[in-house]
């Protein structure tokens, strides 16, 4: 028998969802226009490229990375496309809002967008903790909060710590992971019996799940170098990225093998770890001087995400409710936290090398943003948490958590798709 | 030799439009961000605009914010300043000038406008 | 919006004298300053970055330093060609990228 969508969540979503687009709408029409300087082809084609970059890293990355569950691949793609699609729409009014509005209307450029696609890949990271066990209607609500969260953080940390695009958005990776780690926290926990092969992997959602990683591999680089603000600064965040990703591969895969009693690699470590290298090194990718460091680093970053991934799983489980597969959140915690120290220690050797005595205040600065981060991300994860425990959205029951057939139309209505 | 060079500027009738270009030589121009920055005649210097070396990022000065839309053509080599609803407060002389990176060896990039124009004058008569 | 504030607005001096020029930002920059020399009907000419880091081609006799928010510009021994306008300048993470008012530096 065939799961149906439940009939209270089919007069709330579409409603919720239509209305809010429509609200949308309505505000880019009275508050935003387009950049009318055109002035050179060759160069806004290059702009629109990075744009692009990311949006292969938000939708198809991301999008498939978080698809391996044997029950919930159909589910976990096309939420996070309708997560993106209504995430920057958001993210580029707020931050539109938040920057430029006193003066008058909202200018777009694809400046403006590229940011905007940067803080809905916040959610993305984000809801890898609580995919499968909600439905669209509260992931509307995961997403104007998080994305309000994020940019609100950001224009904080700008105005009181005095940092740039680059540095204020590389705390998306601390922040994603504990807001997503916090909203977990939140929802209801215990599998019922006879649902736990729901959340275990399959064969061919897995290899959709690598192949997500493989894009976002790809496009790392363009990730951690889209907001700098010179070449000199892009050209070293693209190179210090790519080896730090590199070796995190040869790292994931061999420590994977390292750490299972037979030798074996395991996909779930994979998924995550090729990853790490790119994780860690985003907050001082433009600074790193020489190829070695940032290849050492994405050396430790492959080691702390495979040991992650091979001991934190049942911690996580058990305090969160987080599926084994669902590593995203306490990697990109751990590997977050690491780039931020990484970033710390970059500082004092600068600040040393200088002979500017003022060490421990420039250290504190950088301490400040990051507990600031932290901070706001798990209070804004808990009020979200919170609010999608209200009956108001109708939660799938846990007997239906990571179930595709609760949300999706199958003709042939096979009950082990 | 590293050259900016003004041109553009003139009388014009308050409300009217106008618009400088700033030619760049002796230098890669399509790694630089640009400014522009203007100074009325026996008053400090004031900030005016902003552009990215691409050209995908543009900051205004809230006096100008609306009016003055500044953008680039690296092919051509050259900065625009398009300024609209010219009003008497904007006469002044107009600067561009190159933003160059000074790195810092790890925590930082520090920037300057390390090269100026000789700047051309704007009068915006009511 | 940062505004930054240049102490004193006018400084006379002799030739052979050790001058101090403040300037202080409403908030916290760091170190990203600049200070720049303006001869009448010449454009601005950079002499300091980062608050402290002369500018290729300066003298020596310049010489810069502060962080946050207090900084100042000083030349050890003024030369007949040093007699301009100075102004300091933000630049900080995000515009606007405001100028002090500047301070005339005369021959007494």
């Known amino acids: 028998m065939s799961s149906k969508y439940p009939r209270s969540v089919r007069r709330c979503l579409p409603l919720w969802a239509l209305t809010l687009e429509a609200a949308l709408i309505l505000l880019f029409y009275f508050f935003t226009h387009y950049d009318a300087s055109l002035e050179d082809q060759k160069g806004l084609v290059a702009s629109y490229q990075v744009g692009q970059d990311l949006t292969v890293m938000a939708a198809i990355g991301l999008g498939f990375l978080t698809s391996s569950f044997r029950r919930h691949s159909w589910s976990s793609v096309a939420f996070n496309l309708f997560m993106l699609a209504l995430g920057v729409q958001w993210a580029i009014l707020l931050d539109g809002f938040l920057s430029q509005f006193p003066s008058g209307k909202v200018v777009i450029t694809l400046f403006s967008i590229r940011l905007a696609t940067m803080s809905a890949l916040s959610v993305l990271i984000s809801v890898d903790a609580v995919l499968g066990k909600v439905n669209l209607a509260q992931l509307v609500v995961m997403v104007l909060v998080e994305v309000t969260a994020l940019g609100n953080l950001r224009m904080v940390i700008s105005n009181i710590f005095n940092t740039d695009y680059h540095m204020n958005m590389m705390h998306i990776y601390v922040f994603a992971a504990y807001f997503g780690l916090s909203v977990a926290w939140c929802l209801p926990k215990p599998l019922p019996e006879g649902t736990e092969d729901k959340d275990q992997t399959a064969t061919i959602p897995s290899l959709s799940a690598m192949l997500g990683a493989l894009f976002l591999w790809m496009f790392w680089p363009s990730f951690n170098s889209a907001l700098l603000r010179s070449p000199i600064e892009r050209k070293n965040a693209v190179f210090n990225t790519y080896y730090a990703v590199a070796v995190s591969v040869v790292t994931a895969i061999s420590g994977s093998s390292l750490a299972h009693p037979q030798g074996k690699i395991s996909k779930t470590y994979v998924h995550s770890a090729v990853l790490a290298g790119g994780v860690a090194v985003g907050t001082s990718c433009h600074l790193i001087p020489s190829p070695w460091l940032a290849m050492v680093l994405g050396l430790v970053a492959g080691l702390i995400s495979v040991g992650g991934a091979k001991y934190l799983p049942g911690c996580c489980n058990r305090v969160l409710g987080i599926p084994h597969s669902s590593i995203m959140g306490y990697n990109f915690s751990l590997l977050g936290l690491l780039g931020e120290i990484i970033y710390i220690v970059l500082l004092v050797l600068d600040t040393v090398g200088a002979g500017n005595g003022m060490i421990g205040f420039q250290v504190l600065l950088s301490i400040g943003e990051l507990s600031l981060a932290i901070v706001i991300a798990l209070m804004s994860g808990l009020l979200t948490g919170l609010l999608l425990n209200l009956k108001i959205w109708k939660a799938p029951h846990e007997a239906k958590y990571f179930d595709d057939q609760v949300f999706w139309k199958f003709p042939h209505l096979a009950v082990g798709f | 030799e590293v050259q900016l060079v003004e041109s553009g500027g003139g009388v014009v009738q308050s409300g009217r439009s106008l618009r400088l270009s700033c030619a760049a030589s002796g230098f890669t121009f399509s790694n630089n961000g640009m400014h522009w920055v203007r100074q009325a005649p026996g008053k400090g210097l004031e900030w005016v605009a902003f552009?990215?070396?691409?050209?995908?990022?543009?900051y205004y000065a809230d006096s100008v914010k609306g009016r003055f839309t500044i953008s680039r053509d690296n092919s051509k080599n050259t900065l625009y300043l398009q300024m609209d609803g010219l009003r008497a407060e904007d006469s002044a002389v107009y600067y561009c000038a190159r933003e160059e990176i000074a790195a810092r060896l790890y925590s930082r990039y520090h920037y300057a406008m390390d090269v100026w124009g000789q700047g051309t004058m704007v009068t915006v008569s009511s | 919006d940062i505004q930054m504030t240049q102490s004193p607005s006018f400084l006379s001096a002799s030739v052979g004298d050790r001058v101090t020029i403040t300037c202080r930002a409403s908030?916290?920059?760091?170190?990203?300053l600049a200070w720049f020399q303006q001869k009448p009907g010449k454009a601005p000419k950079l002499l300091i970055f980062?608050?402290?880091t002369l500018q290729s081609g300066v003298p020596s006799r310049f010489s810069g330093s502060g962080s946050g928010t207090e900084f100042t510009l000083t030349i050890s021994s003024l030369q007949p060609e040093d007699f301009a306008t100075y102004y300091c300048q933000q630049l900080s993470s995000y515009p606007p990228y405001t100028f002090g008012q500047g301070t005339k530096l005369e021959i007494k």
């Open positions: 980062s608050a402290s």
């Open positions: 908030q916290g920059i760091r170190r990203y």
């Open positions: 552009i990215w070396y691409d050209g995908s990022n543009k």
